[in-house]
Amino acid sequence: WELTILHTNDVHSRLEQTSEDSSKCVNASRCMGGVARLFTKVQQIRRAEPNVLLLDAGDQYQGTIWFTVYKGAEVAHFMNALRYDAMALGNHEFDNGVEGLIEPLLKEAKFPILSANIKAKGPLASQISGLYLPYKVLPVGDEVVGIVGYTSKETPFLSNPGTNLVFEDEITALQPEVDKLKTLNVNKIIALGHSGFEMDKLIAQKVRGVDVVVGGHSNTFLYTGNPPSKEVPAGKYPFIVTSDDGRKVPVVQAYAFGKYLGYLKIEFDERGNVISSHGNPILLNSSIPEDPSIKADINKWRIKLDNYSTQELGKTIVYLDGSSQSCRFRECNMGNLICDAMINNNLRHTDEMFWNHVSMCILNGGGIRSPIDERNNGTITWENLAAVLPFGGTFDLVQLKGSTLKKAFEHSVHRYGQSTGEFLQVGGIHVVYDLSRKPGDRVVKLDVLCTKCRVPSYDPLKMDEVYKVILPNFLANGGDGFQMIKDELLRHDSGDQDINVVSTYISKMKVIYPAVEGRIKFS
């Protein structure tokens, strides 16, 4: 019996087609992805093959203005339209709190939404009961397939699930649910979840009874053969893991942003054992036409976005200096504003010992593309912020050793004075440079804001200590020459859309007046 698994993950609000780098589509003839194009391909496969499941491994939420405006209603609407069969909860599904998950998505989805390792407690338990499930058995042709869900247990540090959801260890939570499926004589079981490729592989190895793992969170690109676009494969598709009980378990992920549709064909014997598995992600490029009915629906929903772009988010009573002349040479108040917003967006008081889990921000000055003038009645709009942060990136959480941070700050000024983008703006950091010294030895003081303290204060950076830092995904991926971050980071979790972070902060503060306050000094 043959099953076709179509899968997406980390779509992050890319409902419309995008450029090849998943930013805003500029030249339509070269654009990719989007739900209208995805639907065309899915329908084509559904027509051609008998047993097809369309699955999503989480993080539909967060990433573009679509999410900012529609807050998840767009996810439910278009996933229903595409007739997804199941979805696992990702960490970003909790970005607007539990209410922001329940109302727009859980109550509106016409497909099961899954996670076996999230347990509700207190008053939330009855409110959310039945709205998401640990697993679902789906009839496919004349057979049944069990789908069991899981979500990163780091979600409380990455999003806003509140205090009434407990995120358990994935493997511990999955095993009894898979065992339950076995008692129901379900002998074909897919683990669908959002904990990253390393955990996906561990689940394949450790959870008895799981036949296939469909993952997300780490934006992992797997491919067999010559890859069709810029993404470099982390391994073959499917990635085969040998389980502890000796089975070959295929593990798949489909990069991110709806650029690819994962396509995996599995052959099962009559006892539900995987005999063979093969496939590849399908690049959703312009050779695949956009479905006209879905496209028309997208255009209808778009109208509200255009109106939103020009609405006032808040006011500034000072000039927001985002000029290259400032932000690539010295501390600029636009950099301070953005870093403050980045930290504010990551406030998670999860432990009495820590006032917060993260206190530091770094931001490449070259990523700040425009100032905002206060003389336009102080008004700040989404449109203004899109000029400051036009690249559609995310502000991510990483863990780095102090020694890596020191290297990053040396890189920040290694060719100072040439208006290059690597000059770092900061938050929760005090840095002093001496430009008279040779490149690679210019950081003379580097103090960082403590987290394990009741009164935050600045202490010297310790080279061997592991620190959490918020930074643009561009830096996490080694952009602007920050190869040491990419090579040495100990953990990387994708965060929220950059503009969304800043716009939320401005809306919250209502009136802003960021200053230049001595975060970056030259001796």
């Epitope: 009839p139 004349d142 049944v144 069990g146 009894p176 649910e177 339950k180 499926l181």
Partner: antibody, heavy 119, light 107 residues
Framework: QVQLVQSGAEVKKPGASVKVSCKAS????????IHWVRQAPGQGLEWMGA????????SYNQKFKGRVTMTRDTSTSTVYMELSSLRSEDTAVYYC????????????WGQGTLVTVSS | DIQMTQSPSSLSASVGDRVTITCKAS??????LAWYQQKPGKAPKLLLY???SLETGVPSRFSGSGSGTDYTLTISSLQPEDFATYYC?????????FGGGTKVEIK
């Protein structure tokens, strides 16, 4: 609306067999299990087994295995339960009930069929 | 098989009373618990599933709680139509099993 309509009462002699039917309507017949639950006079409820009409897959309570047969006719959306080698202690009301494949609580029940086993 | 032990087996109460019925499983059932109400000569009726989820159309005076092996059905203010027999059922492990029932009678 969802309805499960069962066949009428039966009187059988010990050693005989009885076949009870359950006709489903108001939902997609092939996507839910049909369970059989019995209740002896003045007693509690006892699950006998279930059939998944989509593929004919059957789960039994081991206590009844070998004596109970469950079949389905998708053309008429009907499920049948046959119990053989009847004994007096099989006298009970037999209910069919609908349940999810994966979460077997019973949201809709038939009206019940009284089977009396007496010599 | 998982044994479901219900207590009490019967109770007398008056209209307006708060009534609590307990159900204990012989092993953990991971919140896969349902409650049914049955009146004489009628089929059982689903009240709650997943411990706490109220079936559509069931009055909010019925509520459920518990975890692990111990579960409770509460009727916050007993109404005349609530006099019936109540059963719990586990659906974690085949064979699905019911409690022995609790008959709620008029005092």
């Amino acid at each position: 609306q969802v309805q499960l309509v069962q066949s009428g009462a039966e009187v059988k002699k010990p050693g005989a067999s009885v076949k009870v039917s359950c006709k489903a309507s108001g939902y997609t017949f092939t996507t839910y299990n049909i369970h059989w639950v019995r209740q002896a006079p003045g007693q509690g409820l006892e699950w006998m087994g279930a059939i998944f009409p989509g593929n004919g897959h059957i789960s039994y309570n081991q206590k009844f295995k070998g004596r109970v047969t469950m079949t389905r006719d998708t053309s008429t959306s009907t499920v049948y339960m046959e119990l053989s080698s009847l004994r007096s202690e099989d006298t009970a009301v037999y209910y069919c009930a609908r349940g999810d494949y994966d979460e077997s609580y019973f949201d809709y029940w038939g009206q019940g069929t009284l089977v009396t086993v007496s010599s | 098989d998982i044994q479901m032990t219900q207590s009490p087996s019967s109770l007398s109460a008056s209209v307006g009373d708060r009534v609590t019925i307990t159900c204990k499983a012989s092993e953990g059932i991971y919140n896969r618990l349902a409650w049914y109400q049955q009146k004489p000569g009628k089929a059982p009726k689903l009240l709650l599933y997943g411990v706490i989820s109220l079936e559509t159309g069931v009055p909010s005076r019925f509520s459920g709680s518990g975890s692990g092996t111990d579960y409770t059905l509460t009727i916050s203010s007993l109404q005349p139509e609530d006099f019936a027999t109540y059963y719990c059922q586990q659906y974690w492990s085949i064979p699905w099993t019911f409690g022995g029932g609790t008959k709620v009678e008029i005092k």
